[in-house]
Amino acid sequence: VKMAETCPIFYDVFFAVANGNELLLDLSLTKVNATEPERTAMKKIQDCYVENGLISRVLDGLVMTTISSSKDCMGEAVQNTVEDLKLNTLGR
Amino acid sequence: VKMAETCPIFYDVFFAVANGNELLLDLSLTKVNATEPERTAMKKIQDCYVENGLISRVLDGLVMTTISSSKDCMGEAVQNTVEDLKLNTLGR
Amino acid sequence: EICPAVKRDVDLFLTGTPDEYVEQVAQYKALPVVLENARILKNCVDAKMTEEDKENALSVLDKIYTSPLC
Amino acid sequence: EICPAVKRDVDLFLTGTPDEYVEQVAQYKALPVVLENARILKNCVDAKMTEEDKENALSVLDKIYTSPLC
């Protein structure tokens, strides 16, 4: 149920976009054989993050991690084990 | 009430550590005149994030942003504006 | 495989209206500062990207979702 | 100024026991995968860092909290 294990290359590209470094984005997009027009499109998205600064990257990263670790993604089963985990792992 | 505005340099350093990018960490630590032994210590923490992979960074980032945007940090006032914002910003 | 909720978020970011996208973000994180940021990013992307750009971005996403690395 | 809840989280990460740290994380995000990750990170830091390393990390935090950038 680990979030990034569901599709690691997606998070690789997402965080490269949000990072703002064009060549780091190129590194990630190389892995999926992205064409030049596809890269240009992704760099336009990256420009928006760069223009809006660090706070923008942090907040959108928060949205992505919140969705990724939500019940919708993690499944009901994970939610149901919370109390068990609190009792067992936390030694209460 | 913006989370990173409460202490932007803290989030700068935290996300540099969790990101796994040594350069970003060095840049952040330069801002607070960290010594070499201090940088070495922070890089040991960063190594733990790197060793545990992307999932680890994302999940711990989620914890930090959740705490930072919790009632304990943001105060009651912010929480109370959520419904207003949903009504106004979302044009419902 | 990618989580459907994440896929929906990204699809709306590219092809939805600003209201649709922000409304979807609000289901997960309804903090004013987060929603304001989501709207700013969405407006920026809509202003910067042509229809062809958006098709190319969707094509990248398709490559990501079908990649052995996903 | 840094939020006290954030400061407490970081202090426990460096100076608390694994149980204390995970218990504190659970107050904010009690998902099993999150708590498991918190424990893994805490154990890693405890194994990797000497007492001197931890003092140096706390010194960095002190510099952060007293910085004009905070």
Epitope: N21, L23, L24, L27, K31 | G20, N21, L27 | - | -
Partner: antibody, heavy 120, light 107 residues
């Protein structure tokens, strides 16, 4: 750290093609980025392209698009660069280099270089 | 393309001296900068990355610094093995480019 062993010197005629190899060992090839770089005698370096060994995906310097073609053979952990329509301006030493870092941005481990001479 | 301008193009120094080489980028490269040493007839060797992080096995007499568009490499107490050519290189936008090089010779 690993090793990068490049093929021997080449003397070729203008208009011909050449295929250079870079055999690697001592690291996980499938998760590596390998770049190729050009250096004329007494001059600086020029990045040509990189390849991600895991998928064969490539990124090129626009100046070398259509000129250089990068491939890998995972079974032998070898990277190749096919250089076509050679001119005297292509005479140079060509290096392969493995990327390093988090993220893998830096050209850290280099082959010994292959001298290519283009002459009629 | 981001242009990297290195100076000086060449310099002479004696063993034990301290020298500084500078590199100017035509745009902000946000510290994504590396320095390489290349001895005669050899492959380049990575010395510094992230503008100031020493690569494995590089002696501490080498140090990198800078930010934005201005960067420098300082070599303290020059040793005989330090003579050769030095190059800076950015990793910000495509293509990653190198400076023209600085040839460091024995006085």
């Amino acid at each position: 750290q690993g090793q990068m062993q490049q093929s021997g010197a080449e003397l070729v005629k203008p208009g011909a093609s050449v295929k250079l190899s870079c055999k690697t060992s001592g690291f996980t090839f499938s998760s590596s980025y390998i770049s190729w770089l050009k250096q004329k005698p007494g001059q600086s370096l020029e990045w040509i392209a990189w390849i991600y060994a895991g998928t064969g995906g490539t990124t090129y310097n626009q100046r070398f698009t259509g000129k250089a073609q990068l491939t890998v053979d995972s079974s032998s952990s070898t990277a190749y660069m096919h250089f076509s329509s050679l001119t005297t301006d292509d005479s140079a030493i060509y290096y392969c280099a493995r990327h390093y870092g988090n993220p893998p941005a830096w050209f850290a481990y280099w082959g010994q270089g292959t001298l290519v001479t283009v002459s009629a | 393309d981001i242009q990297m301008t290195q100076s000086p193009a060449s310099l002479s120094a004696s063993v034990g001296e301290t020298v500084t080489i500078t590199c100017r980028a035509s745009g902000n490269i946000h510290n994504y900068l590396a320095w390489f040493q290349q001895r005669q007839g050899k492959s380049p060797q990575l010395l510094v990355y992230n503008a100031e992080t020493l690569a494995d096995g590089v002696p501490s007499r080498f140090s990198g610094s800078g930010s934005g568009t201005q960067y420098s490499l300082k070599i303290s107490s020059l040793q005989p093995e330090d003579f050769g050519s030095y190059f800076c290189q950015h990793f910000w936008s495509r293509p990653p480019t190198f400076g023209g090089g600085t040839k460091l010779e024995i006085k």
